[in-house]
């Protein structure tokens, strides 16, 4: 059920680190924050769920990476890319980006100063 871990490359690289962590709790945490009482998201019912569940696991996963601005930015970009197709309109995309940039702070990490979240060929 688990990945056969990883892309090729140096084990200390950000890409390798991002590939090793489970970003799904981060994705669900943000979706819950922007969707609130809206319809069921994915196969997990976020309507009646405490966001702290996802947030704790999300922060734990981000904490597994070297706390560098570049690695944090790559993780945020990966989350954005993973969820891009689920964001229904421009407003939702902007909300998601805003929450995403707040994520490091919520986990008590340094937020990347410059992090371009325009992914998926400009669609998001």
């Amino acid at each position: 059920m688990r990945r056969e871990r990883g892309r090729q490359g140096d084990s200390s690289s950000c890409e390798r680190q991002v590939d090793r962590v489970n970003l799904k709790p981060c994705e669900q945490h943000i979706m819950q924050r922007i969707m609130g009482e809206q319809e069921q998201y994915d196969s997990y019912d976020i309507r009646s769920t405490r966001s702290s569940d996802q947030q704790q696991r999300c922060c734990d996963e981000l904490n597994e990476m070297e706390n560098t601005q570049r690695c944090m930015c790559e993780a945020l970009q990966q989350i954005m890319e993973n969820q891009c197709d689920r964001l229904q309109d421009r407003q939702m995309v902007q909300q998601f980006k805003r929450e995403l940039m707040n994520l490091p702070q919520q986990c008590n990490f340094r937020a990347p100063q410059r992090c371009d979240l325009d992914v998926s060929g400009g669609r998001c």
Epitope: I46, S52, Q56, N63
Partner: antibody
Framework: EVQLVESGGGLVKPGGSLRLSCAAS????????MNWVRQAPGKGLEWVSS????????YYADSVKGRFTISRDNAKNSLHLQMNSLRDADTAVYYC????????????????WGNGTTVIVSS | EIVLTQSPGTLSLSPGERATLSCRAS???????LVWYQQKPGQAPRLLMY???TRATDIPDRFSGSGSGTDFTLTISRLEPEDFAVYYC?????????FGQGTKLEIK
């Protein structure tokens, strides 16, 4: 073959110490969070502690906080539980368990368990 | 701490019957973090379901899981002799990662 083997259990007096170990084989140990779960005689399962892949995040059950210390050595594929100030209530079979997650959807679960090592705290 | 309460404590049924096991949380738990385990006497626990409703590898399709929020259910559609065991639910989203006290499924 994916395997976890616990060791270090035994009989110890209240207030004493014991160090449990768990040897992992058949998988890339450093890719997985690890847990200790215990089961008192005739009772249910009780989660004891967890440690993430890099040891950066560690959690304990309230019942063992301040007395037990979890650690891991990724180079040696081993997990440890240092148990101090042991009490009668710590008498149990201690299981080491690997935690994995579903890559496509995200849920976590303990999919590989050792057979357990028995700790008896008695005077 | 999230307290998980399983009911009934003991369930007496015959092979071929349907079993419904309940797990109730003291506060809301994401489906993503709800797991079921099976344990037989003298053995280590075995992973059964995760994400509330996804069967683990090699678990037969007579086992199914459902629920959300505070109420979760494990259903065994037609009991086989090897299904008689103790079943535990666990939440692993928020530390401490608590287990329910277990439901013993015994042969009637």
């Amino acid at each position: 073959e994916v395997q976890l083997v616990e060791s270090g259990g035994g009989l110890v007096k209240p207030g004493g110490s014991l160090r449990l170990s768990c040897a992992a084989s058949g998988f890339i140990f450093s890719d997985y969070n690890m847990n200790w779960v215990r089961q008192a005689p005739g009772k249910g399962l009780e989660w004891v502690s967890s440690i993430t892949r890099s040891s950066r995040t560690i959690y304990y059950a309230d019942s063992v906080k301040g007395r037990f210390t979890i650690s891991r050595d990724n180079a040696k594929n081993s997990l440890h539980l240092q148990m101090n100030s042991l009490r009668d209530a710590d008498t149990a079979v201690y299981y080491c368990a690997r935690e994995d997650f579903d890559v496509s959807t995200g849920p976590y679960y303990m999919d590989v368990w050792g057979n357990g090592t028995t700790v008896i705290v008695s005077s | 701490e999230i307290v998980l309460t399983q009911s009934p404590g003991t369930l007496s049924l015959s092979p071929g019957e349907r079993a419904t096991l309940s797990c109730r949380a003291s506060q809301s738990v994401s489906n993503m973090f709800l797991v079921w385990y099976q344990q037989k006497p003298g053995q280590a626990p075995r992973l059964l379901m995760y994400g509330a409703s996804t069967r683990a590898t090699d678990i037969p399709d007579r086992f199914s899981g459902s629920g959300s929020g505070t109420d979760f259910t494990l259903t065994i559609s037609r009991l086989e002799p090897e299904d008689f065991a103790v079943y535990y639910c666990q939440q692993n989203g928020n530390s401490p990662y608590t287990f329910g006290q277990g439901t013993k499924l015994e042969i009637k």
